[in-house]
C-alpha cells in the first residue's frame, strides 16, 4: 500500500529526529513498551509490523553509525542533573505566573482560547512555537504581521508535531503587529536558549523519556498525529505537491536486506544497556506560547472563565510533569551515589 | 497474572445477532490491542478484526465488515464482539486474543447457528 | 490475500528427534508468527517476530526464514510437543494463517 509506506517513512524520520537509539532500542526490545506504543499509536497490525521491520533496520544502522550511543545516554543524563535545577526554577515560577494569569485571562481574538493557541498543550512542543520553530515564513500585509505556511511546512509541520487543523487555522489568522512580532521574537530566542542546553541534540527532545510508560504513549501519540496528518493530507486535493518525503527512507528493503544466520539481533546488541528514564524537556516550551499571547497588552477586555479554566489545568499538568521530572532528578543523583 | 475471560457458549437461530464478551485482567485494559479469531470445528483459524480499548478504534478484516462488530467497556475491562445476520457459516470458536503478538488468548466462546 | 501454505499437513516424529515444519507464504512477508494448539484448547503464542520464543517455550524451539520461506524447529523431540502448530503473517490484511501441522509422536 504506498499511503502506508509514505506514512512508514514519515514514521523512520520522525524516529531518526526525535528518538534515542537506547528509547529506540527500548521501544523493540521491551513487548510492554511495543504493545503501549502500538496502542498509543492505533496501528493496524499490518502498519505495526511494516513500522517495527524498518525500526529494527534503523537501529541497527543508528547502533553502527553510533558507536558510543551509550556514552551519549551518560552525557544527557549528565546534562540534566547540572541543568534540572535551573529548569525546575524557572518552570516553578512559570506554573505560579500561569495560575495568577488564570485569574484574569482574556479572549484573546474572536472568541479563541488557549485551546486554539497550544496545540495539545504537552505533546512534544507547541503547535504555534512549532509553526515558528518549522520556519514558518512571518510577513506583513496590510499593516498586520499574518503566519502563513509555504505548502511544504505546512506538510512538515503537520506531519511531524500532528497539529491539529484548528491551530494551523489559527496561525493563519490575523494578529497584531505586536503581538505576532513579540511570538516570533521571544519563540526564536527560547528555541536559541533550549538549543544551547541540548547542543546538536536539539532534536532529540525523547532522547530523555519520563518513563517507559510516558515515553512509550508520547512516541505512539506522535505517530498516531502524525498518521492522521498523513491521511488528511492524502485527502486535500493539492497537498501532494507539498507532501513531505523522507530523503533517505529506510524501509523493510533498505538499509539490512538479508538476514544473516550470525547477525546479532537488536535484542543482543542492547543487551546490558542501563536505560535509565528521564522526562521530556521539550514541554518546557509550552508555558513560553502561552505568556507570548497571554501576557500582552493587547488582550481584549472582558475575562472568559472558561480560559481561566484552561489555563489552570495547563498549570496544573506542567506541576504533574514537573513532580514526574523532579522524582528522575532524585534517582539519577541516587544513582550517581551509588 | 493476565487472563482473558470468555462468555459462556451460546446457541442462537438463523438471522439473529448475538454478542461475546471478553473481560481481561492482570494488565492495563488500555494499553494492549485486542483481536478476534474464528475456528471453525476441525478446521484452521480466521482473523475477524482488532480493536483499540482506549479510543475504539476498529480494524476489520474486510470479510467480517458488517458482519461483526467489535466494542468496549473501558470500565469493566470487557472486549465486546457482536454478529449479526447470523447463519450456520458462523457457527465456530470465537477467541478473543491480547496485544500485537496475540501473546494471551481467552478460551472461546463456541456460538452454535440452528434453527 | 496472501495464503500461507504449511507443510507436512500431519508428521508423527520420535522422542528425541529433530523435527522442522515450513510454511510459505504467497507473497513476502515482514514477521512469521506461530502458535501452538492442543486438542480442545485455545491457541498460544509459540515464537513471534519470526525467531522470538514467547515466555515459557522451550528453547529447543526455534523459528527462522525470511520472504516467502519461513521454518518452525525443534531440536529434540519431547513429548509435551505434541500438537498443531500454525503460522501467521501480519504483513497484508487479511491477516492470514496457515493449514496448521499437525505433530505427532510417532
Known amino acids: 500500500d504506498p499511503e502506508s509506506s509514505i506514512f512508514i517513512e514519515d514514521a523512520i524520520k520522525y524516529f531518526k529526529e526525535k528518538v534515542s537509539t537506547q528509547n529506540l532500542l527500548l521501544l523493540l526490545t521491551d513487548n510492554e513498551a511495543w504493545n503501549g506504543f502500538v496502542a498509543a499509536a492505533e496501528l493496524p497490525r499490518n502498519e505495526a509490523d511494516e513500522l517495527r521491520k524498518a525500526l529494527d533496520n534503523l537501529a541497527r544502522q543508528m547502533i553502527m553509525k553510533d558507536k558510543n550511543w551509550h556514552d551519549k545516554g551518560q552525557q544527557y543524563r549528565n546534562w540534566f542533573l547540572k541543568e534540572f535545577p535551573r529548569l525546575k526554577s524557572k518552570l516553578e515560577d512559570n506554573i505560579r505566573r500561569l495560575r495568577a494569569l488564570a485569574d484574569g485571562v482574556q479572549k484573546v481574538h474572536k472568541g479563541t482560547t488557549i485551546a486554539n493557541v497550544v496545540s495539545g498543550s504537552l505533546s512534544i512542543s507547541s503547535g504555534i512555537l512549532t509553526l515558528v520553530g518549522m520556519g514558518l515564513a512571518p510577513f506583513t500585509e496590510g499593516g498586520s504581521l499574518v503566519l502563513l505556511e509555504p505548502g511544504m511546512e505546512l506538510g512538515i509541520t503537520a506531519a511531524l508535531t500532528g497539529i491539529t487543523s484548528s491551530t494551523i487555522d489559527y496561525g493563519k489568522k490575523w494578529w497584531t503587529q505586536a503581538q505576532a512580532h513579540d511570538l516570533v521574537i521571544k519563540s526564536l530566542d527560547k528555541l536559541k536558549e533550549v538549543k544551547e542546553f541540548l547542543g546538536e541534540n536539539i532534536s532529540n527532545f525523547l532522547s530523555l523519556a519520563g518513563n517507559t510508560y510516558q515515553l512509550t504513549r508520547g512516541i505512539g501519540k506522535d505517530i498516531r498525529a502524525l498518521r492522521r496528518a498523513r491521511a488528511n493530507l492524502q485527502s486535500v486535493p493539492h497537498a501532494s505537491a507539498s507532501r513531505p518525503r523522507v530523503t533517505e527512507p529506510i524501509s523493510a528493503e533498505s538499509g539490512e536486506q538479508v538476514e544473516r544466520v550470525n547477525e546479532p539481533s537488536i535484542l543482543e546488541m542492547s543487551r546490558g544497556v542501563k536505560l535509565t528514564d528521564v522526562a521530556p524537556v521539550s514541554f518546557f516550551l509550552v508555558l513560553d506560547v502561552v505568556y507570548l499571547v497571554y501576557e500582552s497588552k493587547h488582550l481584549h477586555e472582558g475575562a472568559k472563565s472558561e480560559t481561566a479554566e484552561e489555563l489552570k489545568k495547563v498549570a496544573q499538568e506542567l506541576e504533574e510533569k514537573l513532580n514526574i521530572l523532579n522524582n528522575n532528578y532524585k534517582i539519577l543523583q541516587a544513582d550517581q551515589e551509588l | 497474572q493476565v487472563q482473558l475471560q470468555q462468555s459462556g457458549p451460546e446457541l442462537v437461530k438463523p438471522g439473529a445477532s448475538v454478542k461475546m464478551s471478553c473481560k481481561a485482567s492482570?494488565?492495563?485494559?488500555?494499553?494492549?490491542?485486542i483481536s478476534w479469531v474464528k475456528q471453525r470445528t476441525g478446521q484452521g483459524l480466521e482473523w475477524i478484526g482488532e480493536?483499540?480499548?482506549?479510543?475504539?478504534?476498529?480494524y476489520y478484516t474486510e470479510k467480517f465488515r458488517g458482519k461483526a462488530t467489535l466494542t468496549a467497556d473501558k470500565s469493566s475491562n470487557t472486549a465486546y464482539m457482536q454478529l449479526s445476520s447470523l447463519t450456520s457459516e458462523d457457527s465456530a470458536v470465537y477467541f478473543c486474543?491480547?496485544?500485537?503478538?496475540?501473546?494471551?488468548w481467552g478460551q472461546g466462546t463456541t456460538l452454535t447457528v440452528s434453527s | 490475500e496472501n495464503v500461507l501454505t504449511q507443510s507436512p499437513a500431519i508428521m508423527s516424529a520420535s522422542l528425541g528427534e529433530k523435527v522442522t515444519m515450513s510454511c510459505r507464504a504467497s507473497?513476502?512477508?515482514?514477521?512469521m508468527y506461530w502458535y501452538q494448539q492442543k486438542s480442545d484448547a485455545s491457541p498460544k503464542l509459540w515464537i513471534y517476530?519470526?525467531?522470538n520464543l514467547a515466555p515459557g517455550v522451550p528453547a529447543r524451539f526455534s523459528g527462522s526464514g525470511s520472504g516467502n520461506s519461513y521454518s518452525l524447529t525443534i531440536s529434540s523431540m519431547e513429548g509435551e510437543d505434541a500438537a498443531t502448530y500454525y503460522c501467521?503473517?501480519?504483513?497484508?490484511?487479511?491477516?492470514?494463517f496457515g493449514g496448521g501441522t499437525k505433530l505427532e509422536i510417532k
Open positions: 480493536m483499540f480499548p482506549g479510543s475504539g478504534t476498529t
Open positions: 492482570g494488565y492495563t485494559f488500555t494499553d494492549y490491542v
Open positions: 486474543a491480547r496485544g500485537t503478538t496475540a501473546d494471551y
Open positions: 507473497s513476502s512477508v515482514n514477521y
Open positions: 517476530y519470526t525467531s
Open positions: 501467521q503473517q501480519f504483513t497484508s490484511s487479511p491477516y492470514t
